[in-house]
Interface confidence: medium
């Protein structure tokens, strides 16, 4: 299953399959997730080691047993790959690293006014993988405001150095935020020239394209079909690049197929997995396990559940079958692709779905062993769980926020439905940033069921929580995916990085905002909160957040929306925007429903009709 916990001051011994430099443990974990063989990783922050060569070292590891011995190492961080973690699998990494210079091949330099603009330039440059920006206070005046666009053979920095007044980060192309746009066309009987960066075997051009999309240096590809004249080159997928970013030439060639990486697509990227099953095809590779199962789909499920399995072949040969069950060969290779592809066999083959980010039809939880006032504009895909709950009577208007917690489930505040309990009048918009983008043609979800907490009473602050079951499940994308829920009774975690988002009022007597707003707000202890709300009862089922001096808060129209906190690189839904005295008033924190206290209720209500809990637990 999915394991999300990080181990502080621990280093996995042995099992190395690759190493690189990464700016933090979360980026290291992402690289492990996308590496075909990596199950575990260990990261050495700059503070953890004196050896300059090993600072920022990210060590990717494999293990036949799925685990490795841990040794104590002060400052080190270790953890698991997020393979099998559904919607948490993403190559998108938005963080900016202050005081850090990520080294690589500098191929472009320009003057910009902010690190955000530098990141945007990198995202809009086809070859840029990461960047460094010298701030206005950089010690050498001639380098100030320089934006250096960079790449490297592996897509990660060739070195990382601590350097004051420098900020670094990665391209947001994997976040589907590139302005470049992409070529979806597949060109039959055409071969591209230029530099080959890798060679893998694939059953078709579509798998070849997906591999190209997620390869750090692949910009385009050529695939040789299974009837290509040279037998040794059949099913070869050549991943390519060029100085210009486009093929310098193309040659008409029978039984070849060419195309482009889809990394520069805007708003939608292919999933980093291959779900198609190929009948009459055998995939060769290192044998991991052989098991008897009933049907090719069960074989694929078995491969997906066995974390080291990369691909499989289900044999229908009489000698490989017993009654209704046949042999399911679970296999792997060094690069994640078959080492041999044979056609005209009595088998069916396919790939593990361990990197598919759709996950199952469930809500997500984690186990570990009212516009925003004073906020700023959000960007695309920054809060992909945020939804807008709108009411359509004569006119249509935004009333509340909500959080997507599963394909078919939204969590919000019960008070949003005060006086409006009819499900037919509600429209739920997901995957949006600007309310003005909503037109009569914009798709929306309708409500199948509104489940208000049984102890909620209108005009009272208690048990202000409701679940919405959508009529149809939503697909996950970079812009529309769920937020993980905390563990039941989560009281030990100290959250220091918390944000509230919504389209609500920007001041007490304001109006709904067009662009989704975000504000970073510190949590306040319940004791402190109680002092400020002396005639209200602040219960353990509530959590408060706000600044002593006021000025930043949720407000009308943000109700029901998320209070999310980032912990160990993972966002969790800590609170639901509920109530407060006015907005952003001095010493009057916002009060939120504490989600951890309602985990039993959420689990009970999101049980499927067959009684199976619809919970996806990454731990």
């Amino acid at each position: 299953g999915c394991l999300t916990q990080l181990y502080e001051n621990a280093f996995f011994r042995g099992g190395d399959v690759a190493s690189m430099y990464t700016p933090n443990a979360q980026y290291c974990q992402m690289r492990c997730t996308f590496h075909p063989r990596c199950l575990l990783f260990s990261f050495l922050p700059a503070s953890s080691i004196n050896d300059m060569e090993k600072r920022f070292g990210c060590f990717l590891k494999d293990s036949v047993t799925g685990t490795l011995p841990k040794v104590h190492r002060t400052g080190a961080v270790s953890g698991h790959s997020l393979k099998q973690c559904g919607h948490q699998i993403s190559a998108c990494h938005r963080d900016i690293y202050k005081g850090v210079d990520m080294r690589g091949v500098n191929f472009n330099v320009s003057k910009v006014s902010s690190v955000e603009e530098c990141q945007k330039r990198c995202t809009s440059n086809i070859r840029c993988q990461f960047f460094s920006y010298a701030t206005q206070t950089f010690h050498k005046a001639e380098y100030r405001n320089n934006c250096l666009l960079k790449y490297s053979p592996g897509g990660t920095p060739t070195a990382i150095k601590v350097l004051s007044n420098v900020e670094s980060g990665f391209s947001l192309k994997p976040c589907a935020l590139s302005e470049i746009g992409c070529h979806m066309n597949i060109f039959q009987h055409l071969a591209f020239s230029d530099v080959d960066v890798a060679r893998v075997l694939t059953p078709d051009a579509f798998v070849c394209r997906t591999i190209c999309t997620y390869h750090p240096n692949c910009l385009f590809f050529t695939f040789y079909t299974n009837v290509w004249k040279i037998e040794s080159q059949r099913n070869v997928c050549l991943l390519k690049t060029s100085e210009s970013g486009t093929p310098s030439s193309s040659t008409p060639q029978e039984n070849t197929i060419s195309g482009y990486s889809l990394l520069t697509c805007k708003r939608t990227l292919p999933e980093p997995c291959h779900s198609k099953i190929y009948p009459g095809v055998d995939f060769g590779g290192e044998e991991l396990n052989v098991t008897f199962v009933k049907g090719v789909n069960v074989c694929q499920e078995t491969c997906t559940k066995m974390i080291r399995c990369q691909f499989f072949t289900y044999s229908l040969l009489p000698e490989d079958c017993k009654e209704e069950k046949c042999k399911c060969f679970l296999r792997l290779s060094m690069d994640g692709s078959p080492t041999r592809i044979a056609y005209g066999t009595q088998g069916s083959s396919g790939y593990s779905l361990r990197l598919c980010n759709t996950g199952d039809n469930s809500v997500c939880t984690t186990k570990t062993s009212t516009r925003i006032v004073g906020g700023t504009n959000s960007s695309w895909g920054e809060w992909p769980w945020q939804v807008s709950l709108q009411v359509k009577l004569t006119a249509q208007r935004h009333l509340c926020g909500g959080s997507l917690i599963g394909h078919q489930w939204v969590l919000t505040a019960a008070h949003c439905f005060d006086g409006l309990p009819l499900q037919d009048v509600w429209r739920i918009y997901s995957g949006i940033l600007n309310l003005s983008d909503i037109t009569k043609d914009t798709p929306f979800s309708q409500i199948k069921e509104i489940i208000i907490h049984q102890n909620y009473k209108v005009s009272e602050g208690n048990h202000d929580i409701a679940l919405i079951k959508l009529q149809a499940p939503l697909n996950y994308t970079e812009f529309q995916k769920p937020i993980c829920l905390p563990s039941k009774g989560d009281t030990s975690t100290i959250y220091t990085n918390c944000w509230v988002t919504g389209w609500g009022f920007s001041k007490e007597k304001g109006e709904i905002q067009n662009i989704l707003q975000k504000v970073n707000i510190p949590l306040v202890t319940n004791e402190e909160c109680q002092k400020r709300y002396q005639d209200y009862k602040i219960t353990q089922r509530m959590v408060c957040a706000g600044y002593k001096e006021g000025g930043k808060d949720a407000c009308k129209g943000d109700s029901g929306g998320p209070l999310v906190c980032k912990h160990n690189g993972m966002w969790r839904l800590v609170g639901i925007t509920s109530w407060g005295e006015g907005c952003a008033r001095r010493e009057q924190p916002g009060v939120y429903t504490k989600v951890a206290e309602y985990m039993d209720w959420i689990l009970e209500k999101t049980q499927s009709s067959d009684g199976k809990a619809q919970m996806q637990s990454p731990a």
């Epitope: 005639d535 209200y536 001095r586």
Partner: antibody, heavy 116, light 106 residues
Framework: EVQLQQSGAELVKPGASVKLSCTGS????????MFWVKQRPEQGLEWIGR????????KYDPKFQGKATITAETSSNTVYLQLNSLTSEDTAVYYC?????????WGQGTLVTVSA | DIQMTQSPSSLSASLGGKVTITCKAS??????IAWYQHKPGKGPRLLIH???TLQPGIPSRFSGSGSGSDYSFSISTLEPEDIATYYC????????FGGGTKLEIK
């Protein structure tokens, strides 16, 4: 609809004790704080104390410490105010009020007259 | 303890006229002041909280203002049903009521 129903007027002798009640309807007292407020004839309002009926936690204004005892009975959705060692200074109308909105809901008041 | 000094203690005004009551706190109360109307035989009625925020259903002739330790409450056009005693309440630190202002018709 939220309502607070207080017990009837009391005539008591100096030195005696009296126990007033306030029963809530339309809400559960466990979910909020309940307050008692005093108003002496021709004088202003004074906050006596606050109780959390769920756990019995009480906060008194220091000048009522020892004079007033606030209790709650969640099964009947009722809070009580007991006044001890009564003197003429305790002659007043006593109001119960519901928290969660700056004393937005009040009982009708109970007149306590201390007289020999 | 925060003390609230309310003035005047009584006030005679004409119907249709304007009425202003003030409350002075013994320290800065950060705008955490509420105003109540109290009629005989009833519980007090909350009119305004956080200095100037009118409760739902309260007529707009009632208003409040102030900051720091000085606050005021006004009725712009006195109506017969406004005859009552008015109290301020600080809720910055626990609760303290002002002494009240008895409003009568001239």
């Amino acid at each position: 609809e939220v309502q607070l129903q207080q017990s009837g007027a009391e005539l008591v002798k100096p030195g005696a004790s009296v126990k007033l009640s306030c029963t809530g309807s339309g809400f559960n007292i466990k979910d909020i704080y309940m307050f008692w407020v005093k108003q002496r004839p021709e004088q202003g309002l004074e906050w006596i104390g606050r109780i959390d009926p769920e756990n019995g936690n009480i906060k008194y204004d220091p000048k009522f410490q020892g004079k007033a005892t606030i209790t709650a009975e969640t099964s009947s959705n009722t809070v009580y105010l007991q006044l001890n060692s009564l003197t003429s200074e305790d002659t007043a109308v006593y109001y119960c009020s519901r928290g969660g909105g700056l004393f937005a809901y009040w009982g009708q008041g109970t007149l306590v007259t201390v007289s020999a | 303890d925060i003390q609230m000094t309310q003035s005047p203690s009584s006030l005679s005004a004409s119907l249709g006229g304007k009425v202003t009551i003030t409350c002075k706190a013994s320290q800065d109360i950060n705008k955490y002041i509420a105003w109540y109307q109290h009629k005989p035989g009833k519980g007090p009625r909350l009119l305004i909280h956080y200095t100037s925020t009118l409760q739902p259903g309260i007529p707009s002739r009632f208003s409040g203002s102030g900051s720091g330790s000085d606050y005021s409450f006004s009725i712009s056009t006195l109506e017969p049903e406004d005859i009552a005693t008015y109290y301020c309440l600080q809720y910055d630190d626990l609760w303290t009521f002002g002494g009240g202002t008895k409003l009568e018709i001239k």
